[in-house]
């Protein structure tokens, strides 16, 4: 399987909410001995391999934000801790999973990574990640709503998120 990032860049004004999205592609084994660990974290660009460094999102680690379930099942993070930090990660049965960040500030800008680990009991695990950038703008140059830019593999025309 692979992870796709529908959008590589999100440009948002301060105070707005944004949902960053990744999508699980390809055949997904739904056997009872396979589970999926999905999570989010921040990283830096100044490295050889994107997403190799794991930084917290609003002081929550990738362990705090993880989803753990089988196949294409739906799941949500533990509401309490994440929501106190204005965050919520979710996954649906179509392979989409996301993190929603509320009331953005400039401090939320940077590179975000989604990680999926396929865990086969008694076997090795397979891990893949996707990366996207969030730019939070202040002042008169800021858009009125979040604007999202498709990844290069898709149509390059930008789309305004509702």
């Amino acid at each position: 399987f692979k992870v796709a990032t529908p959008y590589s860049l999100y440009v948002c004004p301060e105070g707005q909410n944004v949902t960053l999205t990744c999508r699980l592609l390809g055949p997904v084994d739904k056997g009872h001995d396979v589970t999926f660990y999905k999570t989010w974290y921040r990283s830096s660009r100044g490295e050889v391999q994107t997403c190799s460094e794991r930084r917290p999102i609003r002081n929550l680690t990738f362990q705090d934000l993880h989803l753990h379930h089988g196949g294409h099942q739906a799941a949500n993070t533990s509401h309490d801790l994440a929501q106190r930090h204005g965050l919520e990660s979710a996954s649906d049965h179509h392979g989409n999973f996301s993190i929603t960040m509320r009331n953005l500030t400039l401090l939320d800008s940077g590179l975000y990574c989604c990680l999926v680990v396929e865990i086969r009991h008694h076997h090795s695990e397979h891990r893949v990640h996707g990366a996207m950038e969030l730019q939070v703008q202040t002042g008169k140059d800021a858009p009125s709503n979040c604007v999202v830019y498709p990844s290069s593999s898709q149509d390059s025309e930008n789309i305004t998120a509702a």
């Epitope: 860049l9 921040r42 100044g46 930084r55 002081n59 929550l60 401090l107 940077g110 730019q135 140059d141």
Partner: antibody, heavy 121, light 111 residues
């Protein structure tokens, strides 16, 4: 190690525009970080003017937003400060500085030596 | 804007003694548990130099006699023991909200 160096006119006439250049060596301004302009008035007060991020996005001090622009020339690894409608109140030492971008902490870890700009007729 | 008020404006300390500089913000500089407060040292004719970030993290290469503490709106920089080389201006700076702002500075002198 990364180095930053400011250049530009030392004297500007009132109502004219100021253009300063910051040349960065030993680090690509498109790789990471935010690239800032900060000024220090006579008497030592420091004021952050704005930054251009590694991907070209800008954020400015709201008090200057109507007359400031920060741009860059990626192949020359330079970024620029443009400040129009200069008055004597803009007399200061102007610094360019690098700051972390998109991490838990945002701070100025590398500074240029500064260039003094006097606004006078 | 977040206003940072430094005190005292100037400070004279004997060599080997402790210097304490305070910085108070007009509002909190914390963001979900991260403290966005820095301290810089500036010597005459030089640019400011980062000493402390995140209120208490000492920048690489900065002597251990420099330490920072505080949370919310109240912060302090401690220098102990003070050395001749520490004669300089010291500034606090917040990056919690745009515009990022600096304190007015504290001038450290030797008695």
């Amino acid at each position: 190690a990364v180095q930053l160096q400011e250049s530009g006119p030392g004297l500007v006439r009132p109502s004219q525009s100021l253009s300063l250049t910051c040349t960065v060596t030993d680090y690509s301004i498109t790789s990471d970080y935010a690239w800032n302009w900060i000024r220090q008035f006579p008497g030592s007060k420091l004021e952050w003017l704005g930054f251009i991020g590694y991907s070209g996005n800008t954020n400015y001090n709201p008090s200057l937003e109507s007359r400031i622009s920060i741009t860059r020339h990626t192949s020359k690894n330079q970024f620029f400060l443009h400040l129009n409608s200069m008055t004597t109140e803009d007399t200061a030492t102007y610094y360019c500085a690098r700051s972390l971008y998109g991490g838990s902490h945002w701070y100025f870890d590398v500074w240029g030596a500064g260039t003094t700009v006097t606004v006078s007729s | 804007d977040i206003v940072l008020t430094q005190s005292p404006a100037s400070l004279a300390v004997s060599l080997g003694q402790r210097a304490t500089i305070s910085c108070r913000g007009s509002e909190s500089v914390e963001y979900y548990g991260t403290i966005l407060m820095q301290w810089y040292q500036q010597k005459p004719g030089q640019p400011p130099k980062l000493l402390i970030y995140g209120a208490s993290n000492v920048e690489s290469g900065v002597p251990a006699r420099f330490s920072g503490s505080g949370s919310g709106t109240d912060f302090s920089l401690n220098i102990h023991p003070v050395e001749e080389d520490d004669i300089a201006m010291y500034f606090c700076q917040q990056s919690r909200k745009v515009p990022w702002t600096f304190g007015g500075g504290t001038k450290l002198e030797i008695k």
